[in-house]
């Protein structure tokens, strides 16, 4: 089941899932001057079995200039240094190759696409937060956030984190310290 | 709570045009497109078009285009659809509508008439 | 365009029986399919998304089926406030298109 709104936002904080859970959906937002191609699901879709889950549709952009130059997902290395990724992106992609039964992992990167990624979660979904290069984390408790079903309404628990101050980013369960970090979480990374 | 609030009941005159809002409220408005819903009695619902805030992108019917005409108020998280060059067929009521159709405003009925 | 087809406008059931209303495209739409309830002055209610995947707060009395062209929302245990006109709905590609509409009555 959908929750109903987004988690929780934090100042000087983002999230991200390790993993989506069945039902997950992953809005096809392009960057300025593109669009969504319009035939085609307006969201990919985390989907599948106990055994076997994986990302439904996939997501196209277009330039907005008439011309329907339409490309394919993956990008190439020019256009992944265009998205801002950096080696921390990889790190948490290389945490994402764990199979979470029911679960998806990161869908990769399609061409053009918008900086930030634009989730539907489900119920039962857990993110984890950090904050963003230059604060440092202050726990009171666990710095995650779930969506949980009460009463029939759906709301996600506060997660226990501050960020104050000057100091690298915290990371996300599973993580190893990063050689190299200097934009901390890619926007692409999070969802608002 | 994430909730999309139209504006009221419009009764206008054939030839004229108008102008509904739908505002809302509890999510990152920027963050999602804004639908825009036609419905008459026997006519079941027509989907007219939408708008993404955050570009202001577009997306009409082709039925609509030239009829509906979408802007969106990022500092109030508004959108507004117009209506123009109003006949007997425009009056309906009108359903904006959000996150992947998951939410909808109450509605504004749009009567037309002389 | 595409096309949705509901091909029953009425449908008239009893509390505690089980009902599928469907819906038939006019071309393969995948699973990009919706299902909405819309009771008497009131505007839709999302029921489901994806052909098949319910949203939070909707009884699980209701399921969503169906891929490509032929779809069926099933409404098993039907309940008096179950009475309401279903739409179904496609948004595999623009113009987003909707079904003609199914009115449940409760016998």
């Known amino acids: 089941e959908l929750c109903d709104d987004d988690p929780p936002k934090i100042t000087h904080a983002t999230f991200k899932a390790v993993a989506y859970k069945e039902g997950t959906m992953l809005n096809c937002e392009c960057k300025r001057g593109f669009r969504r191609i319009k035939s085609g699901s307006p969201y990919m879709l985390c989907t599948g079995n106990s055994s076997h889950s994986s990302w439904d549709n996939q997501c196209q952009c277009t330039s907005s200039a008439a011309r329907n130059t339409t490309k394919q997902v993956t990008p190439q290395p020019e256009e992944q240094k265009e998205r801002k990724t950096t080696e921390m992106q990889s790190q948490m992609q290389l945490a994402d190759q764990v199979s979470l039964p029911g679960h998806c992992r990161e869908p990769p990167p399609w061409e053009n696409e918008a900086t930030e990624r634009i989730y539907h979660f489900v119920v039962g979904q857990t993110v984890y937060y950090q904050c963003v290069q230059g604060y440092r984390a202050l726990h009171r408790g666990p710095a995650e956030s779930v969506c949980k079903m009460t009463h029939g309404k759906t709301r996600w628990t506060q997660p226990q984190l501050i960020c104050t101050g000057e100091t690298e980013p915290s990371q996300f369960p599973g993580e190893e310290e990063p050689q190299a970090s200097p934009d901390g979480l890619p926007e692409s990374e999070t969802s608002r | 709570q994430i909730q999309l609030q139209q504006s009221g009941a419009e009764l206008v005159r054939p030839g004229t045009s108008v102008k509904m809002s739908c505002k809302a409220a509890g999510y990152t408005f920027t963050n999602y497109w804004i639908g825009w819903v036609k419905q008459r009695p026997g006519h079941g619902l027509e989907w007219i078009g939408d708008i993404h805030p955050g570009g202001s992108y577009t997306n009409y019917n082709e039925n609509f285009k030239g009829k509906a005409t979408f802007t969106a108020d990022t500092s109030s998280s508004t959108t507004y659809m117009q209506l123009s060059s109003l006949t007997s067929e425009d009056s309906a009521i009108y359903f904006c509508?959000?996150?992947?159709?998951?939410?909808w405003g109450q509605g504004t009925p749009v009567t037309v008439s002389s | 365009d595409i096309v949705l087809t509901q091909s029953q406008k009425f449908m008239s059931t009893s509390v505690g029986d089980r009902v599928s209303v469907t819906c038939k495209a006019s071309q393969n739409v995948g699973t990009n399919v919706a299902w909405y309830q819309q009771k008497p002055g009131q505007s839709p209610k999302a029921l489901i998304y994806s052909a098949s995947y319910r949203y939070s707060g909707v009884p699980d009395r209701f399921t969503g089926s169906g891929s490509g062209t032929d779809f069926t929302l099933t409404i098993s245990n039907v309940q008096s406030e179950d009475l309401a006109e279903y739409f179904c709905?496609?948004?595999?590609?623009?113009?987003?298109?909707f079904g003609g509409g199914t009115k449940l009555e409760i016998k």
């Open positions: 709905q496609q948004y595999n590609s623009y113009p987003y298109t």
């Open positions: 509508t959000s996150r992947n159709f998951a939410k």
